[in-house]
């Protein structure tokens, strides 16, 4: 799979492959994988990909299921790249405060916050 | 500040305090703090709170600016709690795949993905 494929297209294809291979993936009935309790997904990327690793090690490889796990590893690579971009640019306090305001505003409106 | 205050109310109050104390916070013109390049905020919580720590250490404390940083530390505490909930519950593969599908679906529709 060329890494040049746009990430958005990669995600769409991965969703389709996930549906296709569901039966094969759930074959191991004893396997248990951590599942986040909330829906603030971006906070849990590390655990999600650890779970994917566990699942991959327990799944018979071959055919397009390999493509599914290859896609997922490319998505992880993209997310790792995004995480790197969190701390690379040292800016002035002014810009940091604008970003902090945006972050808190998003928390206020979009995060799933329990009372 | 009682930690019993709902997180949503805490975030709102913090946004207001941020506006109030902006002039004081930007007083240090040489200070530089990492600012994420993208808007996938949840991926960057660690760096954001490191930045807040840097800012706090460089800001003259007293009055309601102390309340601002206290609030921000309570918000961090809430987020740390959410992060803990990412990996506490070991579930069957079926549930994990449901969550993975939801995660990819959210990535597909809500994440800020560069082409």
């Amino acid at each position: 799979i060329p890494t040049e494929i746009p990430t958005s297209a990669l995600v769409k294809e991965t969703l389709a492959l996930l549906s296709t291979h569901r039966t094969l993936l759930i074959a191991n009935e004893t396997l248990r994988i951590p599942v986040p309790v909330h829906k603030n997904h971006q906070l849990c990327t590390e655990e999600i990909f650890q779970g994917i690793g566990t699942l991959e090690s327990q799944t018979v490889q071959g055919g397009t299921v390999e493509r599914l796990f290859k896609n997922l590893s490319l998505i992880k690579k993209y997310i790792d790249g995004q995480k790197k971009k969190c701390g690379e640019e040292a800016r002035r306090v002014n810009q940091f405060l604008d970003y902090l305001q945006e972050f808190l505003g998003v928390m206020n409106t979009e995060w799933i916050i329990e009372s | 500040i009682p930690t019993e205050i709902p997180t949503s109310a805490l975030v709102k109050e913090t946004l207001a305090l941020l506006s109030t104390h902006r002039t004081l916070l930007i007083a240090n013109e040489t200070l530089r703090i990492p600012v994420p390049v993208h808007k996938n905020h949840q991926l960057c919580t660690e760096e954001i709170f490191q930045g807040i720590g840097t800012l706090e250490s460089q800001t003259v404390q007293g009055g309601t600016v102390e309340r601002l940083f206290k609030n921000l530390s309570l918000i961090k505490k809430y987020i740390d709690g959410q992060k803990k909930k990412c990996g506490e519950e070991a579930r069957r593969v079926n549930q994990f795949l449901d969550y993975l599908q939801e995660f990819l679906g959210v990535m597909n529709t809500e994440w800020i993905i560069e082409s």
Partner: antibody
Framework: QVQLVQSGAEVKKPGASVKVSCKAS????????INWVRQAPGQGLEWIGY????????RYNQKFKGRATLTVDKSTSTAYMELSSLRSEDTAVYYC????????????WGQGTLVTVSS | DIQMTQSPSSLSASVGDRVTITCKAS??????LSWIQQKPGKAPKTLIH???RLIDGVPSRFSGSGSGQDFTLTISSLQPEDFATYYC?????????FGQGTKVEIK
């Protein structure tokens, strides 16, 4: 492809207001800040301010604070720059420009809108 | 506000010449500087960002260098389409400020 298309030229009287639009296409509008820059005839470039369509937050060059108002309409992916109390020195080409990331370089520019202030 | 001083304000050069334009910031702006090209009657176009990073699609004859307060734009071999006005822009702090421009004319 990514594009910013601005409204047409305007002629205004001193004291009036003008509202220039900038329609974005080819990308998710809320992901990038929109900056406004102006250029008086034969002069250099001057930054007016930016707006963050993600949260409607705007920041202005002090020189324009109180006279310039930046707004967005997310439903149409359009940014607006309104300048009030116009004077002859406001005669300029006004450009919108997209920020590549948060507080980054301007990677896409609009074609410009000429605003002429004359009695 | 941060002042950006560009020099020269204009220069005459021939096709094939190596051209250098400098920009000096009134205070440290790290590397948050871009170089912008503008042709008469056209919208500006960003060529370089972060002082030395060439934007996709911009010819490699353009290069940028510098950090802190002193920056340089170099055109290694001037082409006919490069005759234009060039501006530096600091996006380190608000308000963002531009240099006054350097007009590159045909000798």
């Amino acid at each position: 492809q990514v594009q910013l298309v601005q409204s047409g030229a305007e002629v205004k009287k001193p004291g009036a207001s003008v509202k220039v639009s900038c329609k974005a296409s080819g990308y998710t509008f809320t992901n990038h800040h929109i900056n406004w820059v102006r250029q008086a005839p034969g002069q250099g470039l001057e930054w007016i301010g930016y707006i963050n369509p993600y949260n409607d937050y705007s920041r202005y060059n002090q020189k324009f604070k109180g006279r310039a108002t930046l707004t967005v309409d997310k439903s149409t992916s359009t940014a607006y720059m309104e300048l009030s109390s116009l004077r002859s020195e406001d005669t300029a080409v006004y450009y919108c420009a997209r920020d590549y990331g948060n507080f980054w370089y301007f990677d896409v520019w609009g074609q410009g809108t000429l605003v002429t202030v004359s009695s | 506000d941060i002042q950006m001083t560009q020099s020269p304000s204009s220069l005459s050069a021939s096709v094939g010449d190596r051209v250098t334009i400098t920009c000096k910031a009134s205070q440290d702006i790290n590397s948050y500087l871009s170089w912008i090209q503008q042709k008469p009657g056209k919208a500006p176009k960003t060529l370089i960002h972060r002082a030395d990073r060439l934007i996709d699609g911009v010819p490699s004859r353009f290069s940028g260098s510098g950090s802190g307060q002193d920056f340089t734009l170099t055109i290694s071999s001037l082409q006919p389409e490069d005759f234009a006005t060039y501006y530096c822009l600091q996006y380190d702090d608000f308000p963002y400020t531009f240099g006054q421009g350097t007009k590159v004319e045909i000798k």
